[in-house]
Structures are given as structure tokens and as C-alpha cells.
């Protein structure tokens, strides 16, 4: 069950999915991976506020036990829901290879 | 790919199953479930250090851009990797009902 | 906190060059895109090109490409923008600025007036 | 490059009532399901200062008041209730596609 998308913080403040420029020395892939320089990393940020894109029954049990509980159980997080893959072109010993990752880059977030 | 399972915080500060327990009332179930009449919630809590149990690349990419933009870019969440079914005797129009959830109790966790 | 510091002004010489800073302070600045936009009197903004300072990896806008040059000094937290053969065209106030999520630049210098006059 | 075409030119508006802006990509500025479309205020002698970031989402410190919304190629900034401190230049920008590019702006005062 995907609850409501209405984020009672305000436009943007709840979980959904965004990018983070990253270059190959910020995610120490320098030295395995030659192409692309650069990555649009899309992630998923934000605050998962009462039944905001709750994932599953799991997390609307979350909800209501940190409702109770806040110094013992956590507010549900935000996470991936699915991936898109991405082709990496990395070094090997005789020259480079193609690689496809399909859990690396988000596609769309929930709560859970 | 699973990453390391020794936690640098001590024990049982990092990621890891926990049972909380919580009554009908406490779950906002009582108007509409019979049994039990209370339940073990099994859910994953505790901190994601650097790669510590990282469900897949994703998780990866976000430990270190963690570390790189720790104010952008939140650190890795504790979630289930996997559940185990729970059934509920449920109260129906015309009496009772066994429902089988697949989705509330974590049996397993990682950092994402 | 936050803070991207920019001198005040410049006033240079056709022909010459000028080298403008930007001190980064209260965040990690290899962390985080540093990015030069410029604006003319009374005129709109025009994006110059942007400088990851943690490789020192830069890109233009084609316009600039021969007009500015974008480094990075770690050590000191600047960035830094070179502007060569100065005409009076090239008379604006030059402002830096900090990419975060989704290409937002959210934090921004006061800005460097660059008066081009003999 | 992605010309981002911004109106009115100009507005007056009334203290309380809602001002609106629209920008219009020549191209679309989505990419993987964002759209990459950014809102700034500036004032006379001042940087300029990020109201909304990826169409929708308010900057850090930004009254409830400011708003945008579109996708694709269509956007718009609204500001409602329109208070004093509003009057400025605004201006659409998009960091979808190197070089990233300004509308031309909008002026907004007080009727």
C-alpha cells in the first residue's frame, strides 16, 4: 500500500527522490571505473512524517510505534523503492569491460 | 552484496533485529482485529556506519556521500531485508476472518 | 555557517586580466560544486561554468571558453576565475556560488563588480 | 542550448492578492522523473536567492508563500499572499543540460 503523497512539512521536505552530482574520486571508483567521469546520482531524501508514501504494513506499524516510542523505535526512512540500471565502463587487466549495476541508482522512493 | 556484520559502535548499536512489543491499541488495530491481542513486532533499528551490512551498490554510493556532504546527504537506514507472515484474526461484516500479512514483521536487516 | 566571500570590486585595463576568489567557509569545500555566473548592468544572469574543487575538473559555457579559466585551491578553500583580454563587455558584476541537490545553487557570494576602463 | 523564455516582463500586484510567473523551456528540462527547474528572487545589490529548487520543492528558509509548480517544459512560481518584502526580480533557471541557462526575468512590484 503506497499512502498519501501530501507532505504535511512542506513541498520538497518529504521523502522523494533527488541527484547528487558525484565525480569518480567522491565515490573512490578512481582507480576501477573509467567512464563516466561523473555520476548523477539520484537518491532518495527526505522526512518520513505519519503514513507519507509508507511502503507496507511494516511501516505504518513503524509509524505508531515511534509515535509511542520515539526513543526506542525510529521514524520509518526513505528509501528506494526500485533501481534503474547503469552502464559502467571499467578497467580490467587486459583493457575494459561494460558492466551493467541494477541496484545503483534510485528510481522512485517510499517509506518503509 | 552483503558488507561486513562487525558493528565499530559495540555491540548492538548497528543495524540489527528487534522485537518491540505493542497491543492492539498501540498499533491502531483494535477496531478491527480480534487476535492476537498483542504482538511482537519484529523491526530493524540501529546505526549504518560505513558500509555495515550494505544491501547493494546504492547503499555503497551513499556511505560515501555521506561522508562527503553529511548535511545534503543522510547516512545509510536500517530496514528488513527480508519478513516472515503473521496471520490476524480479523473482525468481518459476518464475523471472523484469518488474514495473512507478508509484509509486518522484519525477519532479516541491512543498510540502505 | 554557510558564507561564499567575494571582494567588493575590480577595476582593470582593456586588455589585461583580473583574477577573482571566492572563499568557502563553513562546509567541506571539496564537497560540494563551485559554480561563477555573471551578470551585466541592468541585465539578466548568465552562467559562466562550474569547477569540482576535490579534482579541480571544470566545464564552460562555450560562450566563456576562451575568456575564462576556473581553478581550485584546497588548501586555502578558494575558488578562484581568471578573465583575460578584458574589454568593456566584459564589465559586470561576477558572483560564485554553491551547487547542492538537483543543481540548485543555494548558497551565492555578494559578488565582484568588475569595471573594464582605461 | 535550452532557452528558457520567462512572463510577464513586469507585474504589479496588490498586498494579499497572488502573483504568478511563468517560464517556458524551449526543450523539456526532466530527467529521471525530475524536472530540473530552479526559482530565484533578487534584490537591488544583492546575489540573487534560491526560492525553489526542482519545480516544486521550497528552498531552505523560504516562507510558505512561495510555490512552484510544472514539469517538462511549463513552470510557474506563485506568491501568495504578496507582501512587501516581495517586490524583486525573479528569475527561472534550469540545471537540466550544460549550459545551464537564466530566464530573462521578471519584475515585480507593488500595485
Known amino acids: 500500500a503506497r499512502n498519501g503523497d501530501h507532505c504535511p512539512l512542506g513541498p520538497g521536505r518529504c521523502c522523494r527522490l533527488h541527484t547528487v552530482r558525484a565525480s569518480l574520486e567522491d565515490l573512490g571508483w578512481a582507480d576501477w571505473v573509467l567512464s563516466p567521469r561523473e555520476v548523477q546520482v539520484t537518491m532518495c531524501i527526505g522526512a518520513c512524517p505519519s503514513q507519507f508514501r509508507a511502503a507496507n504494513m511494516h511501516a505504518q506499524i513503524k509509524t505508531s510505534l515511534h509515535r509511542l516510542k520515539p526513543d526506542t523505535v525510529p521514524a520509518p526512512c526513505c528509501v528506494p523503492a526500485s533501481y534503474n540500471p547503469m552502464v559502467l565502463i571499467q578497467k580490467t587487466d587486459t583493457g575494459v569491460s561494460l558492466q551493467t549495476y541494477d541496484d545503483l541508482l534510485a528510481k522512485d522512493c517510499h517509506c518503509i | 552484496a552483503r558488507n561486513g556484520d562487525h558493528c565499530p559502535l559495540g555491540p548492538g548499536r548497528c543495524c540489527r533485529l528487534h522485537t518491540v512489543r505493542a497491543s492492539l491499541e498501540d498499533l491502531g488495530w483494535a477496531d478491527w482485529v480480534l487476535s492476537p491481542r498483542e504482538v511482537q513486532v519484529t523491526m530493524c533499528i540501529g546505526a549504518c556506519p560505513s558500509q555495515f551490512r550494505a544491501a547493494n551498490m546504492h547503499a555503497q554510493i551513499k556511505t560515501s556521500l555521506h561522508r562527503l556532504k553529511p548535511d545534503t546527504v543522510p547516512a545509510p537506514c536500517c530496514v528488513p531485508a527480508s519478513y516472515n507472515p503473521m496471520v490476524l484474526i480479523q473482525k468481518t461484516d459476518t464475523g471472523v476472518s484469518l488474514q495473512t500479512y507478508d509484509d509486518l514483521l522484519a525477519k532479516d536487516c541491512h543498510c540502505i | 555557517q554557510v558564507q561564499l566571500q567575494q571582494p567588493g570590486a575590480e577595476l582593470v585595463k582593456p586588455g589585461a586580466s583580473v583574477k577573482l576568489s571566492c572563499k568557502a567557509s563553513?562546509?567541506?569545500?571539496?564537497?560540494?560544486?563551485i559554480h561563477w555566473v555573471n551578470q551585466r548592468p541592468g541585465q539578466g544572469l548568465e552562467w559562466i561554468g562550474d569547477?569540482?574543487?576535490?579534482?579541480?575538473?571544470?566545464k564552460y559555457n562555450e560562450k566563456f571558453k576562451n575568456k575564462a579559466t576556473m581553478t581550485a585551491d584546497k588548501s586555502s578553500n578558494t575558488a578562484y576565475m581568471q578573465l583575460s583580454s578584458l574589454t568593456s563587455e566584459d564589465s559586470a558584476v561576477y558572483y560564485c556560488a554553491r551547487e547542492v541537490l538537483d543543481g540548485a545553487m543555494d548558497y551565492w557570494g555578494q559578488g565582484t563588480s568588475v569595471t573594464v576602463s582605461s | 542550448d535550452i532557452v528558457l523564455t520567462q512572463s510577464p516582463a513586469s507585474l504589479a500586484v496588490s498586498l494579499g492578492q497572488r502573483a504568478t510567473i511563468s517560464c517556458r523551456a524551449s526543450?523539456?528540462?526532466?530527467?529521471?522523473?525530475?524536472?530540473?527547474m530552479n526559482w530565484f528572487q533578487q534584490k537591488p545589490g544583492q546575489p540573487p536567492k534560491l526560492l525553489i529548487y526542482a519545480a516544486s520543492n521550497q528552498g531552505s528558509g523560504v516562507p510558505a508563500r512561495f510555490s512552484g509548480s510544472g514539469s517538462g517544459t511549463d513552470f510557474s512560481l506563485n506568491i501568495h499572499p504578496m507582501e512587501e518584502d516581495d517586490t524583486a526580480m525573479y528569475f527561472c533557471?534550469?540545471?537540466?543540460?550544460?549550459?545551464?541557462?537564466f530566464g530573462g526575468g521578471s519584475k515585480l512590484e507593488i500595485k
Open positions: 563553513g562546509y567541506t569545500f571539496t564537497s560540494y560544486w
Open positions: 526543450e523539456s528540462v526532466d530527467n529521471y522523473g525530475i524536472s530540473f
Open positions: 569547477i569540482n574543487p576535490s579534482n579541480g575538473r571544470s
Open positions: 533557471q534550469q540545471s537540466k543540460e550544460v549550459p545551464w541557462t
